[in-house]
Interface confidence: medium
């Protein structure tokens, strides 16, 4: 009974206090004295994707019935343990994390598939899965050995806005260059033709070899 009351109170405290220094030892050593221990398995190592997403399975060996299960992800770096995210779910239903949580997850029987998003190299660390069978009694607590998540930041890319400006500048430059080239070629060609020639629409051959590759102008002679 004391165990149950204590643990429920503790579970509520966990929400309020999101960072506890040196409390992992307390979890591992002190709690099992008061409550029934439960085995929790999770992979030893996971490499986050280039987009900063890491997924792993947290499996617990339920020794009794559970209608309401609470899953908490803790991050241990040095001697500091921080709560990353937590969700309580009804057995057979989906996990629901807070809207602003970096975690998502699905449940299937005694397995919880957890996904942590938005990870960066500085988030590399040991991510511990903590499972609590909240209801019905008896209360069970299980803490995994942790999953070492390695996060490698991708090679820094130029700022997308900067790339856009470069692209715009190059495009503009090419446009003005081609415009200028056309204008110069036209003016040279107009200077060389006779202004009083009469005739019909005639496709003119290039007057100068160097202009050959640039255009094939149409000359419209007028009476």
């Amino acid at each position: 009974m004391a165990c149950l009351g204590f643990q429920r109170h503790k579970a509520q405290l966990n929400l309020a206090t999101r960072t506890w220094p040196c409390t992992l030892l307390f979890f591992l050593l002190f709690i099992p004295v008061f409550c029934k221990a439960m085995h929790v398995a999770q992979p030893a190592v996971v490499l986050a994707s280039s987009r900063g997403i890491a997924s792993f399975v947290c499996e617990y060996a339920s020794p009794g019935k559970a209608t309401e299960v609470r899953v908490t992800v803790l991050r241990q770096a040095d001697s500091q343990v921080t709560e990353v995210c937590a969700a309580t779910y009804m057995m057979g239903n989906e996990l629901t994390f807070l809207d602003d949580s970096i975690c998502t997850g699905t449940s299937s029987g005694n397995q919880v598939n957890l996904t942590i998003q938005g990870l960066r190299a500085m988030d590399t660390g040991l991510y511990i899965c903590k499972v609590e069978l909240m209801y019905p009694p008896p209360y069970y607590l299980g803490i995994g050995n942790g999953t070492q998540i390695y996060v490698i930041d991708p090679e820094p890319c130029p700022d997308s806005d900067f790339l856009l400006w470069i692209l715009a500048a190059v495009s503009s430059g090419l446009f003005f260059y081609s415009f200028l080239l056309t204008a110069v070629s036209l003016s040279k060609m107009l200077k060389k033709r006779s202004p009083l020639t009469t005739g019909v629409y005639v496709k003119m051959p290039p007057t100068e070899p160097e202009c050959e590759k640039q255009f094939q102008p149409y000359f419209i002679p007028i009476n």
């Epitope: 149950l4 339920s62 020794p63 019935k65 209608t67 019905p136 009694p137 008896p138």
Partner: antibody, heavy 122, light 108 residues
Framework: QVQLVESGGGVVQPGRSLRLSCAAS????????MHWVRQAPGKGLEWVSV????????YYADSVKGRFTISRDSSKNTLYLQMNSLRAEDTAVYYC???????????????WGQGTTVTVSS | EIVMTQSPATLSLSPGERATLSCRAS???????LSWYQQKPGQAPRLLIY???TRATGIPARFSGSGSGTDFTLTISSLQPEDFAVYYC?????????FGQGTKLEIK
Amino acid sequence: QVQLVESGGGVVQPGRSLRLSCAASGFTFSNYGMHWVRQAPGKGLEWVSVISYDGSHKYYADSVKGRFTISRDSSKNTLYLQMNSLRAEDTAVYYCARDDDILTGLYGMDVWGQGTTVTVSS
Amino acid sequence: EIVMTQSPATLSLSPGERATLSCRASQTVSSIYLSWYQQKPGQAPRLLIYGSSTRATGIPARFSGSGSGTDFTLTISSLQPEDFAVYYCQQDYKLPYTFGQGTKLEIK
């Protein structure tokens, strides 16, 4: 010996209220979750509601949600079911049953009362 | 909700015969959340089996339960006259908790 005794049933008009009681004896009432289960005439069993050993968790069947309220008074070793806005389809024998033992969490509804009849009719 | 479907609806057998009652869940139910109950006319239900296969206190050895996932079975190895009753399976894996519609075991 371990015993559950329901009371409070009777004939009531639709829309009215009724409160059922279940007196527990022979065991530590505060160590067990408690259920209400009903059985309409000639029909099967239908789970109605459950309350945890300490009263902190309460769950209901969709058919009674918002109308029925389960509660308990450990000082009196008594379980209650407050039934409001009663309908004809609530007519049934109502049983209280003891839930899983808090030490193992593995038993089913192992102790049942004899039931109390609720008839909703105009 | 999880729908529990029992079959057959009625089973007619003679004393001494073996009875096999089936219970199928519409979704997977972990075996520890499955119970069987016996109910005789005018009486309250009685717990026979919990955790799919464990006999409740005072239940004779002729009653046995088995199954996992979605299919569960209650077997009565040799029927006694007092075994003729209605049998219900029940899950408390997922809320709302649900019972099967019952199998009536009658004397042939």
